[in-house]
């Protein structure tokens, strides 16, 4: 009778183990083991008993102890189970973004291990087992659908393989994939909203805002301003589900003509854009020519406005006439037009909006001097003692300088409040100089003595 | 340290007796298997007897079968070998050898110094 | 009964190969354990269980063991491996068995 012992050994891949063959005869002819498996017969005295070394042991065995003794040749076998923990347990990648709502399946995929009888695959959020199945097949694999939500935000999901050994009198063996870190988001049906201007004029700045609402988790989300080429820095701030972003836009001649502004909202691997045009206009104002700015009473003088080819422009409320970008007038120049002013006004059509711009120019005409009645009366009669301001006004561009002189010498104070004597009476010569040129005019003060009763 | 020290050598006429000691320290005597090996002056290493750890079970080469006789006190921590009828070719350096604690693999990974029996008249 | 055979003496240049044999019937089905003695001292454990190496024992000794013979090398012999070294099996009866010996010398 042969027998073995161990009959049944679990044993880790690659490991080894000690069989003993034995048997009941005291003398047997032969006492052996019959395996595939590299053996080192080991020290054991004594006839009857035999002790192996089976090394390297790779997969399940069942080597063969078999002993001849006189009444006969007899054999018995051990059973040696191998067991190994998985070579690979991987969740099937995944984008790191869902979107709330949608179906997520997780794929887990276990290559090797062994005993398969013992091997569990489960699947996880966090410590929460969401599916538990036998391995099976080669990957095993195990499925499970997740309904995102708003608070998966940040979950880690992961796949874990338990090889429970303990009814072998073992341990728990427990192999653990890399965690899949779920990050999940809402982006709204509706485009971004974007507010800016229609037309920006060349050299100026305007001001975009795009906002959007309903976003989750908000401070994800990326924002991206473009006019044409170029990218907008805006200065973002959060609600608790909304942005808006507002930036600054500086255009330039190389910028003129319609640009397409867009506003995108990247969430997860999703994103929202809004598309608008702006047209980017150059709009000078009009230019007011003068033939000169400065000249003399009785010159005749050309006032143009030119503006932008496609404007259309009025003088002095005047329309074009044909109706276009030039006008223009001729005028006389009289002391009335001193100081005038000549006025352009310029309009475009830039996108459907008008456009106005406006230049003035002002007329100066040299005239005078002048020193006539009204501003300087020829006769005054004043009673003595009386309060009086002599009044002479010299007319005249530019403004004349005035002296009133009686004998060359005397002066009339002119504009000063004085107390009448004797002395004031008398004829003055009134004198009016400037560079265009001299007036006098005589002037004669009369003052009445008091009646004495 | 991991120690074994032999002791009770000497001379003995053809025909004596002689009780060896081994004396172990530093290590769990009772779980190892002890074994006796010994030198001829100028010859080889040969096996004499070895004893398992709680003694129950003796084992000699057939040269020395019936006139040595292997023991151990475990509490001492002592091994011996009790030679009777000593002969000429019974001179040598005896040895005691522990055997790893796995002694199905037979090999000796702690030595003595030795102790020398001669035997002459 | 197993029977272990060696060489009585190899000779080694130093730094060379030091290759020493220890042959028997069906030697590489057992394992086999290698003892280095130096004249006047105890036996040293140098090579057990056919080729792994006690610690202390320099990298080295190296063993090997198949079919009917098992090797001890020692690569780049130095000047203090000059011994005596020993093989040793196990059998039913005897128990224990130790090769002859062989003497390495290092020239």
């Known amino acids: 009778q042969t027998s073995v012992s161990p009959s049944k050994v679990i044993l880790p891949r690659g490991g080894s183990v000690l069989v003993t063959c034995s048997t009941s005869c005291d003398q047997p002819k032969l006492l052996g083991i019959e395996t595939p498996l590299p053996k080192k017969e080991l020290l054991l005295p004594g006839n009857n008993r035999k002790v192996y070394e089976l090394s390297n042991v790779q997969e399940d065995s069942q080597p063969m102890c078999y002993s001849n003794c006189p009444d006969g040749q007899s054999t018995a076998k051990t059973f040696l189970t191998v067991y190994w923990t998985p070579e690979r347990v991987e969740l099937a990648p995944l984008p790191s973004w869902q979107p709330v709502g949608k179906n997520l399946t997780l794929r887990c995929q276990v290559e090797g291990g062994a005993p398969r009888a013992n091997l569990t695959v489960v699947l996880l959020r966090g410590e929460k087992e969401l599916k538990r199945e036998p391995a099976v097949g080669e990957p095993a694999e195990v499925t499970t659908t997740v309904l995102v939500r708003r608070d998966h935000h940040g979950a880690n999901f992961s796949c874990r393989t338990e090889l429970d050994l303990r009814p072998q009198g073992l341990e728990l063996f427990e192999n653990t994939s890399a965690p899949y870190q779920l990050q999940t988001f809402v982006l709204p049906a509706t485009p971004p909203q974007l507010v800016s201007p229609r037309v920006l004029e060349v050299d100026t700045q305007g001001t975009v805002v795009c906002s959007l609402d309903g976003l989750f988790p908000v401070s994800e989300a990326q924002v991206h301003l473009a006019l044409g080429d170029q990218r907008l820095n805006p200065t973002v701030t959060y609600g608790n589900d909304s942005f808006s972003a507002k930036a600054s836009v500086s255009v330039t001649a190389e910028d003129e003509g319609t640009q397409r502004l867009t506003c995108a909202v990247i969430l997860g691997n999703q994103s929202q854009e809004t598309l608008q045009t702006v047209t980017i206009y150059s709009f000078p104002a009009p230019n007011v020519i003068l033939t000169k700015p400065e000249v003399s009473e009785g010159t005749e003088v050309t006032v143009k406005c030119e503006a932008h080819p496609r404007a259309k422009v009025t003088l002095n409320g005047v329309p074009a006439q044909p109706l276009g970008p030039r006008a223009q007038l001729l005028l006389k120049a009289t002391p009335e037009d001193n100081g005038r002013s000549f006025s352009c006004s310029a309009t475009l059509e830039v996108a459907g909006q008008l456009i106005h711009k406006n230049q003035t120019r002002e007329l100066r005409v040299l005239y005078g001097p002048r020193l006539d009645e009204r501003d300087c009366p020829g006769n005054w009669t004043w009673p003595e003692n009386s309060q009086q301001t002599p009044m002479c006004q010299a007319w005249g561009n530019p403004l004349p300088e005035l002296k009133c002189l009686k004998d060359g010498t005397f002066p009339l104070p002119i504009g000063e409040s004085v107390t009448v004597t004797r002395d004031l009476e008398g004829t003055y010569l009134c004198r009016a100089r400037s560079t265009q040129g001299e007036v006098t005019r005589k002037v004669t003060v009369n003052v009445l003595s008091p009646r004495y009763e | 340290q991991v120690q074994l020290v032999e002791s009770g050598g000497g001379l003995v006429q053809p025909g004596g007796s002689l009780r060896l000691s081994c004396a172990a320290s530093g290590f769990t005597f009772n779980s190892y298997y002890i074994n006796w090996v010994r030198q001829a002056p100028g010859k080889g290493l040969e096996w004499v007897s070895t004893i398992s750890s709680d003694g129950s079970n003796t084992f000699y080469a057939d040269s020395v079968k019936g006139r040595f006789t292997i023991s151990r006190d475990n509490s001492k921590n002592t091994l011996y070998l009790q030679m009777n009828s000593l002969r000429a070719e019974d001179t040598a350096v005896y040895y005691c050898?522990?055997?790893?604690?796995?002694?199905?693999?037979?090999?000796?990974?702690?030595w003595g110094q030795g102790t020398l029996v001669t035997v002459s008249s | 009964d197993i029977e272990l055979t060696q060489p009585p003496s190899v000779s080694v240049a130093p730094g060379q190969t030091a290759r020493i044999s220890c042959s028997g019937d069906?030697?590489?089905?057992?394992?086999v354990h290698w003892y280095q003695q130096k004249p006047g001292q105890a036996p040293v454990l140098v090579i057990y269980s056919d080729k792994k190496r006690p610690s202390g024992i320099p990298e080295r000794f190296s063993g090997s063991n198949s079919g009917n013979t098992a090797t001890l090398t020692i690569s780049g012999t130095q000047a203090e491996d000059e011994a005596d070294y020993y093989c040793?099996?196990?059998?039913?009866?005897?128990?224990?068995?130790f090769g002859g010996g062989t003497k390495l010398t290092v020239l």
């Open positions: 050898a522990r055997t790893t604690l796995n002694y199905y693999y037979g090999y000796m990974d702690v």
């Open positions: 040793q099996s196990y059998d039913s009866n005897p128990m224990l068995v």
């Open positions: 069906s030697l590489g089905s057992k394992y």
